[in-house]
Interface confidence: medium
């Protein structure tokens, strides 16, 4: 990621270590439209957990806990012959780091576990 | 996210409508641990499309698209009773935008299909 | 009805050994993917390591990077235990130990994100206190 941020090599140095970032997110009114309860409806169900801090935008991250290990079948018993297992995603927020009138922002990488699928898993045999 | 990035009101405000974003990213090297290819082991597989971009942050998005409507059966046969649902996630990443040496950046809401689920469908009665 | 009750726990040395005992009333364990999880004072629950089911898969063991080469899981399927053999145990291993059960077959892959998120596990034990101290 230090490449990306730096100048042209032929351009003066960034002072201080920083940059300039501009205000406002584009596109920050899209919004993901997923179908209604998957996580309710999945044979991999999944419950969320809501973090927030007022010092990370976005302020509000939300990760996903696998229900079960196994998965749910049309009869609504767990199979225990298959995994449910978490998707993660690896996100950025931004970290406000604030001294006096001073403020600052960095970037955070986050892992957030999405959902979960169902996956017929990897079975060691024993020799 | 537009009060986030703004001063204490009683602070000078920012010149220029930007602010300061520190060099590096924390937790840079921080990587998703998923099983191994769950994308194919999946009742409801994905296959991945990579896009690059080099000016933005990452400069690769992968985005998941789901192989079926149904889902994969203990036979390995396609079952349309149920469905194959994508499962999205807003990200941010960085948009770096430069004019001769005038390099500045903007925070940009990408939508990232992160893998699929398997879910009961909603079925809408006839009245 | 369904019981597991750890047992084992000492007052032992850094460098010392211990080993717990997990024995389970009520169910047979060969059915059931067996974690032990431990809880330090301030601290959050999290996964020591956990051994899959025999019956529907391989009895396969899983560790965190923490107690590998250390701690050893095994199971006495006769007696419908399971133990945790604990070696070259350190100042960082005192806690509450736990054990837990869960129906099912546990993937080699899954292994971490289980032990991390113990929520799924059905049954669990009271727990038996390890204290390492000089």
């Known amino acids: 990621g230090e490449t990306f941020f730096q100048k042209p090599e032929s351009c003066p140095p960034v002072p201080g270590g920083s940059m300039k970032l501009d205000i406002g997110i584009i596109n920050e009114n899209q919004r993901v439209s997923m179908s209604r309860n998957i996580e309710s409806r999945s044979t991999s169900p999944w419950d969320y957990t809501v973090t927030w801090d007022p010092n990370r935008y976005p302020s509000e991250v939300v990760q996903a806990q696998c229900r079960n290990l196994g998965c749910i079948n049309a009869q609504g018993k767990e199979d225990i012959s298959m995994n449910s297992v978490p998707i993660q995603q690896e996100t950025l927020v931004v970290r406000r780091k604030h001294q006096g009138c001073s403020v600052s922002f960095q970037l955070e990488k986050v892992l957030v576990t999405v959902g979960c699928t169902c996956v017929t898993p990897v079975i060691h045999h024993v020799q | 996210g537009e009060t986030f990035f703004q001063k204490p009101e009683s602070c000078p405000p920012v010149p220029g409508g930007s602010m300061k974003l520190d060099i590096g990213i924390i937790n840079e090297n921080q990587r998703v641990s998923m099983s191994r290819n769950i994308e194919s082991r999946s009742t409801s597989p994905w296959d991945y499309t990579v896009t690059w971009d080099p000016n933005r942050y990452p400069s690769e998005v992968v985005q998941a698209q789901c192989r079926n409507l149904g889902c994969i059966n203990a036979q390995g046969k396609e079952d349309i009773s149920m469905n194959s649902v994508p499962i999205q996630q807003e990200t941010l990443v960085v948009r770096r935008k430069h004019q001769g040496c005038s390099v500045s950046f903007q925070l940009e809401k990408v939508l990232v299909t992160v893998g699929c689920t398997c879910v009961t469908p909603v079925i809408h009665h006839v009245q | 009805q369904v019981q597991l009750v750890e047992s084992g726990g000492d007052l032992v040395q850094p460098g010392g050994s211990l080993r717990l005992s997990c024995a389970a009333s009520?169910?047979?364990?060969?059915?059931?993917?067996i974690g032990w999880f431990r809880q330090a004072p301030g601290k959050e629950r999290e996964g020591v390591a956990c051994i899959s089911s025999i019956s529907n898969s391989d009895g396969r063991a899983y560790y965190v990077d923490s107690v590998k080469g250390r701690f050893t899981i095994s199971r006495d399927n006769a007696k419908n235990t399971v133990y945790l053999q604990m070696n070259s145990l350190k100042l960082e291993d005192t806690a509450v130990y736990y054990c837990?059960?869960?129906?099912?077959?546990?993937?080699?892959?899954?292994?971490?994100?289980?032990?991390?998120?113990?929520?799924?596990?059905?049954?669990w034990g009271n727990g038996t206190l390890v204290t390492v101290s000089s």
């Open positions: 837990a059960a869960e129906r099912g077959r546990i993937d080699p892959d899954v292994a971490g994100y289980f032990l991390r998120e113990s929520y799924v596990m059905d049954y």
């Open positions: 009520g169910f047979t364990l060969d059915d059931y993917v």
